[in-house]
């Protein structure tokens, strides 16, 4: 049977359906690659540009290959096993209305049976697989795989490996409750937020009183000690680590292979020799990164820093003087950490809000 | 390694029939989609048929539709094309192609044979 | 229907030269380009496949690009052995061919 020989596989939609937001489709294609990756090793990534392992496609008709789409109703879409040029990509019907309701034909669920074919899975003859040739709403908010679909996928890739567990070094450093204490790099981690420092990082779940501690070798061996900017981009379990010219790039908890790469590959002035701090704000989809007096904005979709930067951190954030040790973004607010303090900031109104101590995080 | 060797090409009436065969080896066969494309004597390539990995799903050029017909027989290796009611414009040689592993054809053609001439002339 | 159509139709060039050959596609194909090359007397050999993957121990010489309608094939620095006919290939549908011709 086709399988990918690799672990980490990307995917560009090549085109959007007008039905739809296209914010809404590339959601709804990270939430159906999860479907897959929740159960296996695989991981995959979103490409803006360039040729992907598995491409998607909205198109009528002819559209590139042997397999013409019929019009409404019939053949929703289809896909290639795994292999190079078309193989592994997913074709969908433009002429279905794709919703993400029980209107329509619901993008999720054809998106995952699709991709299974992408990733290897022949149709099942048990109605209760998505792999079941014939399509029938189901509940995207509830939806779960059937017991076959899992067997059939891990014969192919096998069972997911663990992330790492965050578990407690040997020698903690004393209590964070410190009024000097200062962080290198903060940020959230899915519903975590991570406080580094150093060779280990701080991690809880904000409004528990619960703090856990973890050196940064012991989760992430190839990730080196003294980070310096950190940012997630939530939608696409994706965590960026900084260190002077160098950055890395984790998926779901696991390092991407091919980093660090240069912090220049991203837009930067050959005089940026570190980044002070990071932030992805994700009602923007922008970084914002923080560069001695300065900012740069990076945006996210089109994979470019945006023209017109750097610009002045003062000008610009107004009560913000530099400089800045790291900054989170949580609940609509920038947390912006300078020493033993932190400023509240909110970006819809330009101002301080509150100004707190750095451990405040953690009940101090 | 992949081969695949083509045969049953000669001289043939107009209205008259031929039947090529092409024996693949090297490469399990099975799961394979494979082709016929032909050439002019002078002119450029143009695909003719293509026949899914269990014979089921077939495609023809509009210019051969209801004249030719592809088959596999996937036990011996070996793929056929039916060529009935020849006209002079079928004159070419014919190149079996192999696509690669799917569920749906690509039309990316890998791997080909040498080719088997058909020449249609009275 | 969709059809190929190539440029130039032949193309005279010199060793070392770089040279360029395009398809345009009538409809959008999105990345589904590849692109062949025959010698006399020879049966086609794929080059380059997706609009830009290099085929298997195809000379790094040959490079590919373009999406949507708009390809094109660059030989770098041509060699003896290129002279030969390219053509642009989608699904069933071929490029009517470049011969590439020693000037």
């Known amino acids: 049977r086709s399988r990918w020989m690799k672990r980490y596989l990307t995917y560009r939609i090549y085109n959007y359906t007008p039905d739809m937001k296209r914010e809404d489709v590339d959601y709804i294609f990270q939430k159906a690659f999860q479907v897959w990756s929740d159960v296996t090793p695989l991981r995959f990534r979103k490409l803006h540009k360039d040729e992907a392992d598995i491409m998607i496609l909205f198109a009528f008709g002819a559209h590139g290959d042997f397999n013409y789409f019929d019009g409404k109703g019939g053949t929703l879409a289809h896909a290639f096993y795994p292999g190079p040029g078309i193989q592994g990509d997913a074709h969908f019907d433009e002429a279905e209305t794709w919703t993400k309701s029980f209107q329509g034909t619901n993008l999720f669920l054809v998106a995952v049976h699709e991709l299974g074919h992408s990733l290897g899975l022949q149709h099942s003859n048990n109605p209760k697989s998505i792999m079941y040739p014939t399509y029938r709403y189901l509940n995207p908010s509830t939806f779960r795989l059937s017991a076959d679909d899992i067997r059939n996928i891990q014969s192919l890739y096998g069972a997911p490996v663990k992330p790492p567990s965050l578990t407690k070094p040997s020698s903690p450093p004393s209590t964070f409750c410190h009024q000097s204490l200062s962080f290198d790099a903060v940020t959230t981690v899915g519903e975590k937020i991570f406080f580094f420092k150093d060779w280990f990082f701080w991690w809880k779940l904000p409004g528990s009183p619960a703090t856990n501690i973890t050196s940064i070798s012991s989760i992430w061996p190839s990730i080196p000690s003294g980070i310096q900017a950190a940012y997630e981009i939530e939608s696409r379990n994706q965590l960026f680590l900084f260190k002077d010219e160098k950055y890395w790039l984790i998926n779901n908890l696991v390092p991407e292979p091919h980093y660090p790469r240069s912090i220049y590959s991203l837009g930067f002035s050959a005089s940026v020799k570190k980044v002070d701090a990071a932030v992805f704000d994700p009602l923007r989809q922008k970084v914002y990164f923080f560069v001695d007096k300065h900012y740069w904005r990076y945006d996210v979709r089109q994979e470019l820093m945006d023209p017109a930067y750097p610009k002045l951190i003062s000008t610009h954030f107004p009560g913000i003087k530099p400089k800045i040790d790291a900054v989170l973004y949580f609940k609509r607010h920038y947390y912006i950490f300078q020493g033993a303090y932190q400023l509240e900031y909110d970006p819809l109104f330009r101002r301080v809000t509150k100004t707190l101590k750095s451990t405040s995080w953690f009940g101090c | 390694e992949v081969q695949l060797l083509e045969s049953g090409g000669g001289l043939v009436q107009p209205g008259g029939s031929l039947r090529l065969s092409c024996a693949a080896s090297?490469?399990?066969?099975?799961?394979?989609?494979m082709h016929w494309v032909r050439q002019a004597p002078g002119k450029g390539l143009e695909w003719v048929s293509g026949?899914?990995?269990?014979?089921?799903?077939?495609f023809y050029a509009d210019s051969v539709k209801g004249r030719f017909t592809i088959s596999r027989d996937n036990s011996k290796n070996t793929l056929y094309l039916q060529m009935n009611s020849l006209r002079a414009e079928d004159t070419a040689v014919y190149y079996c192609?192999?696509?690669?592993?799917?569920?749906?054809?690509?039309?990316?053609?890998?791997?080909w044979g040498r080719g088997t001439l058909v020449t249609v002339s009275s | 229907d969709i059809q190929m159509t190539q440029s130039p139709s032949s193309l005279s060039a010199s060793v070392g030269d770089r040279v360029t050959i395009t398809c345009r596609a009538n409809?959008?194909?999105?990345?589904?380009l590849n692109w062949y090359q025959q010698k006399p007397g020879k049966a086609p050999e794929l080059l380059i496949y997706?609009?830009?993957s290099l085929q298997s121990g195809v000379p790094s010489r040959f490079s590919g690009s373009g999406s949507g309608t708009d390809f094109t094939l660059t030989i770098s620095s041509l060699q003896p052995e290129d002279f030969a006919t390219y053509y642009c290939?989608?699904?069933?549908?071929f490029g009517q061919g470049t011969k590439l011709e020693i000037k």
């Open positions: 090297g490469f399990t066969f099975s799961p394979y989609w």
């Open positions: 997706a609009a830009s």
């Open positions: 192609a192999k696509d690669i592993r799917g569920a749906y054809s690509s039309g990316l053609f890998d791997y």
């Open positions: 409809q959008s194909i999105y990345t589904y």
């Open positions: 290939q989608q699904a069933g549908i």
């Open positions: 026949i899914g990995p269990s014979g089921g799903l077939t």
